[in-house]
């Protein structure tokens, strides 16, 4: 399965649900389908309010049942890990893919655990992290935001995506704006941030 | 290089049964899920069903619900689909195809079933 | 297991470019977008030429691109070129892979 390289912004942005849960044991196949679902306890819901209406929280993951169809394979057996898991809502369903956005909640930087839960979405639908893979690249828009990691650090993992949001500079214009405490108090975003 | 070789062209009678194999090579065998395809002589592709060699678990098309099975021998990475009471219109090439999440990659050069008194 | 739709012939000349249609309902084409489509030459297994609606397979040229508006898929290959000439069958799949269902098959001739 090739997944390209996401920003937690965008994987935010892009997913229907955002939720932390924890996984509950070994995945069960669904009869007559390519499908099989993880037991989760969900420990709180970070994206899809909406989406999900009056249900109360989600007890299973859905997830193709092979790697060849890019399932997601669950390799912790730690079941009082939480995961932060970025999915999509199918059928009244949350889906998984093995290019999903799944990872330890304690292996995000603190700078991204505070924009999963408040940050991020003051870009959606606005901003867009638009992946530099090769030099030269250029903006194509005012409301993209260049992100290098990949060429800069070698890796999806760099310091724009530990630590930045693309987020409104105004209505036109979106920009890197660091994540850290220190300075977002005094970026614009107290009324994106509330 | 994925491979998908089936057996041999068969004649059978009408409500005999036929075992078409599909043996797999150049991939993880039980990475994959395996679906079975017909054609009949100038006629279109029709989908009969598919198994997961992992499991063994199957689905087949409505169609051949009763009358098809889907086995699989990991061993020997090989895949099965036996049709049981075979009527004239049955006759038609049997392709087996690798499923991936790209759709049917890979497929088997075909069998050809002939049903005739 | 209903079938879905496709002309049962097309043409065109060397160079010029031809679309095949593939209407379903909204339980199949039109509710996701798992539409594929394949070629066929004579006495030849099928091989995937578009995944996903409009994505191609590596080694697949440029020249085949597929879409998709409401319960109607379209495969369109421009610059057709003499080994075109083949049958070509769109295929459509559920969520789960519950079930697949194939195009009755459209066979495409290049003049």
């Known amino acids: 399965c090739s997944c390209a390289p996401t920003h937690p912004q965008t994987a935010f942005c892009n997913s229907d649900l955002v939720i932390r849960a924890k996984f509950m044991g070994s995945p069960e196949i669904i009869e007559t389908t390519l499908y099989q679902r993880y037991e989760i306890k969900m420990t709180k819901m970070l994206k899809g309010f909406d989406a999900v209406g009056n249900a109360t929280g989600f007890r299973f993951a859905y997830t193709p049942a092979m790697e060849s169809l890019c399932g997601y394979v669950h390799k912790s057996q730690n079941r009082s890990e939480e995961f932060l898991i970025a999915g999509r809502l199918r059928n009244g369903n949350l889906h998984i893919t093995a290019c999903s956005f799944l990872v330890p909640w304690h292996n995000l930087s603190p700078a991204q655990q505070k924009a999963f839960v408040k940050t991020y979405s003051a870009g959606c639908g606005v901003c867009t992290v638009f992946p530099c893979s090769a030099i030269p690249c250029k903006l194509e828009s005012d409301s993209h935001c260049l992100w290098t990691d990949q060429i800069l650090m070698g890796s999806e993992k760099g310091y724009q995506s530990d630590h930045f949001a693309c987020l409104p500079r105004n209505p036109d214009l979106c920009t890197w704006q660091y994540l850290g405490v220190s300075m977002t108090r005094s970026l614009p975003l107290a009324k994106a941030e509330a | 290089q994925v491979q998908l070789v089936q057996s041999g062209a068969e004649v059978k009678k009408p409500g005999s049964s036929v075992k078409v194999s599909c043996k797999a090579s150049?991939?993880?065998?039980?990475?994959?899920?395996i679906s079975w395809v017909r054609q009949a002589p100038g006629q279109g592709l029709e989908w009969m069903g598919w198994?997961?060699?992992?499991?063994?678990?199957?689905n087949y098309a409505q169609k051949f619900q009763g009358r098809v099975t889907m086995t699989r021998d990991t061993s020997i990475s090989t895949a099965y689909m036996e049709l049981s009471s075979l009527r004239s219109e049955d006759t038609a090439v049997y392709y087996c195809?690798?499923?991936?999440?790209?759709?049917?990659?890979?497929w088997g050069q075909g069998t050809l079933v002939t049903v005739s008194s | 297991d209903i079938a879905l739709t496709q002309p049962a012939s097309v043409s065109g000349s060397p160079g010029q470019s031809i679309t095949i249609s593939c209407t379903g309902t909204s339980s199949d084409v039109g509710g996701y977008n798992y539409v594929s489509w394949y070629q066929q030459h004579p006495g030849k297994a099928p091989k995937l030429m578009i995944y996903?609606?409009?994505n191609r397979p590596s080694g697949v040229s440029n020249r085949f691109s597929g879409s998709k508006s409401g319960n109607t898929a379209s495969l369109t290959i421009s610059g057709l070129q003499a080994e075109d000439e083949a049958d070509y069958y769109c295929q459509s799949r559920d969520l789960y892979y519950v079930y697949y269902v194939f195009g009755g098959g459209t066979k495409l001739t290049v003049l």
């Open positions: 198994i997961n060699p992992n499991s063994g678990g199957t």
């Open positions: 150049g991939g993880t065998f039980s990475s994959y899920a």
């Open positions: 996903d609606v409009s």
């Open positions: 195809a690798r499923i991936t999440y790209i759709g049917y990659d890979f």
